[in-house]
C-alpha cells in the first residue's frame, strides 16, 4: 500500500478558477489537432486492478511521464496556455515526490507501461493526444490524490 | 459476457437479518471495486456501500454498524449482511461493477433483489 | 454531503420531441457526474460520465453537458425506448468516504 498521508495534494491545488480553466482550455484546443479518437489514454485500463488507495500514486507516474516526455518536448506549442499549465502540473509533480509505495508496484508500472507504449507509438500525434487529455489528468489527479 | 446475479432477498420481520448474494461473472473480483445500491418502493437510488479491490469497505453513513459488505473471490461472489432491520429497509437491493474511469462509474448492474421487512 | 436536485421531477413528451434535464449540484463537483436510465423492473443503466462522455453503446442522440454545479441531459429526439427514468450521480472526493457517492431524485420521462 502507498505511504498515503505523502500520497494527497491539498483540495486547494484543484481550486483556482484561472489555472483549471487554462488547463482545460490547453486540452481543448490540442484535442482539436487530435485526428485518433479511437484512443483513450486515461480510461478504465489505465486503472485496471488498481485499488482507490494506490490511484495517487498511478497518476503521480502518469503526470511525471506527461511532464517529461510530452508537455517539455512540446512546451512551444498551444501557447500562451502550455506556459502557464507546464509549471502548474510540475508544482503537483513536486508536491507528490514523496508518494511512494510500499511492496509491489509491478501491476501499476503495467498499466502506465502500456499508456507510455501507446504515446510512443503514435509518435507526435500520442504527445498531441496525451495534451489533448489534460483535462482527464487534472481531474483524474485531482479524485485519486485529494 | 460479464454479468452480475442478486439473490438472497425475501420476507423478514422486524429485527431480523439476511444476506444478500451477487455472483459475478465475466470479470475478476481482484481487478474491480463492487457497490451495493438500494431503492424503496417508487422511490430513487440510494448507495449503501463499496467492497475495494483490496479488500478495504466504505459505507454511507447511515448504514454504518448495520450493513456490512464481504466477498468471497474463490466463489467470485460479493455479499451484503443486514442486520437489525426496518420496515424502511424494504427496498430493491443492486449489486454493480465500479470501473474507475478516472472517476467511479457504475456499470453494469444486477437485476436486483427485493427485500421486504414486515410482521 | 453534496445534494443533487433533479428537474423537473417528471415531464410528458412525445416521440421525436427534445428533451432537457437538468441535475444541480449543491456544491462544486467539476466534471464527476454521470446519468443513468432506468426502465420500469429494470436496473439503472449507465448513459453518459466525466458529464459528457458517452457510454458504450448510447444512442449519439443523448447527449450531457456542464460543469461545477449545473448539469444537463439531452435526448435530441425522443424515441419509443427512452421512456424511462434518468437519475444523476455525483463523485465528491477528498471528503469523508461516507458520504461519496449521491444520486439525484430522478426525473421520470412518460408518453404524452
Known amino acids: 500500500a502507498p505511504i498515503s498521508s505523502h500520497c494527497r495534494l491539498d483540495k486547494s491545488n484543484f481550486q483556482q478558477p484561472y489555472i483549471t480553466n487554462r488547463t482545460f482550455m490547453l486540452a481543448k484546443e490540442a484535442s482539436l489537432a487530435d485526428n485518433n479518437t479511437d484512443v483513450r489514454l486515461i480510461g478504465e485500463k489505465l486503472f485496471h486492478g488498481v485499488s482507490m488507495s494506490e490511484r495517487c500514486y498511478l497518476m503521480k507516474q502518469v503526470l511525471n511521464f506527461t511532464l517529461e516526455e510530452v508537455l517539455f518536448p512540446q512546451s512551444d506549442r498551444f501557447q500562451p496556455y502550455m506556459q502557464e499549465v507546464v509549471p502548474f502540473l510540475a508544482r503537483l509533480s513536486n508536491r507528490l515526490s514523496t508518494c511512494h509505495i510500499e511492496g509491489d508496484d509491478l501491476h501499476i508500472q503495467r498499466n502506465v507501461q502500456k499508456l507510455k507504449d501507446t504515446v510512443k507509438k503514435l509518435g507526435e500525434s500520442g504527445e498531441i493526444k496525451a495534451i489533448g487529455e489534460l483535462d482527464l489528468l487534472f481531474m483524474s489527479l485531482r479524485n485519486a490524490c485529494i | 459476457e460479464v454479468q452480475l446475479v442478486e439473490s438472497g432477498g425475501g420476507l423478514v420481520q422486524p429485527g431480523g437479518s439476511l444476506r444478500l448474494s451477487c455472483a459475478v461473472s465475466?470479470?475478476?473480483?481482484?481487478?474491480?471495486?463492487m457497490i451495493w445500491v438500494r431503492q424503496a418502493p417508487g422511490k430513487g437510488l440510494e448507495w449503501i456501500g463499496i467492497?475495494?479491490?483490496?479488500?478495504?469497505?466504505y459505507y454511507a453513513s447511515w448504514a454504518k454498524g448495520r450493513f456490512t459488505i464481504s466477498r468471497d473471490s474463490s466463489k467470485n461472489t460479493v455479499y451484503l449482511q443486514m442486520n437489525s432491520l426496518r420496515a424502511e429497509d424494504t427496498a430493491v437491493y443492486y449489486c454493480?461493477?465500479?470501473?474507475?474511469?478516472?472517476?467511479?462509474?457504475?456499470?453494469?448492474w444486477g437485476q436486483g433483489t427485493l427485500v421486504t421487512v414486515s410482521s | 454531503a453534496v445534494v443533487l436536485t433533479q428537474s423537473p421531477s417528471s415531464l410528458s413528451a412525445s416521440v421525436g420531441d427534445r428533451v432537457t434535464i437538468t441535475c444541480q449540484a449543491s456544491?462544486?463537483?467539476?466534471?464527476?457526474l454521470a446519468w443513468y436510465q432506468q426502465k420500469p423492473g429494470k436496473a439503472p443503466k449507465l448513459l453518459i460520465y466525466?458529464?459528457?462522455t458517452l457510454a458504450s453503446g448510447v444512442p449519439s442522440r443523448f447527449s450531457g453537458s456542464g460543469s461545477g454545479t449545473d448539469f444537463t441531459l439531452t435526448i435530441s429526439s425522443l424515441q419509443p425506448e427512452d421512456f424511462a427514468t434518468y437519475y444523476c450521480?455525483?463523485?465528491?472526493?477528498?471528503?469523508?468516504?461516507?458520504?461519496?457517492?449521491?444520486f439525484g431524485g430522478g426525473t421520470k420521462v412518460e408518453i404524452k
Open positions: 450521480q455525483a463523485c465528491v472526493y477528498g471528503d469523508s468516504a461516507d458520504s461519496r457517492y449521491t
Open positions: 465475466g470479470f475478476s473480483l481482484s481487478s474491480y471495486a
Open positions: 454493480a461493477r465500479d470501473r474507475f474511469v478516472g472517476v467511479d462509474i457504475f456499470d453494469p
Open positions: 456544491e462544486d463537483i467539476y466534471t464527476n
Open positions: 466525466w458529464a459528457s
Open positions: 467492497i475495494d479491490i483490496d479488500g478495504s469497505t
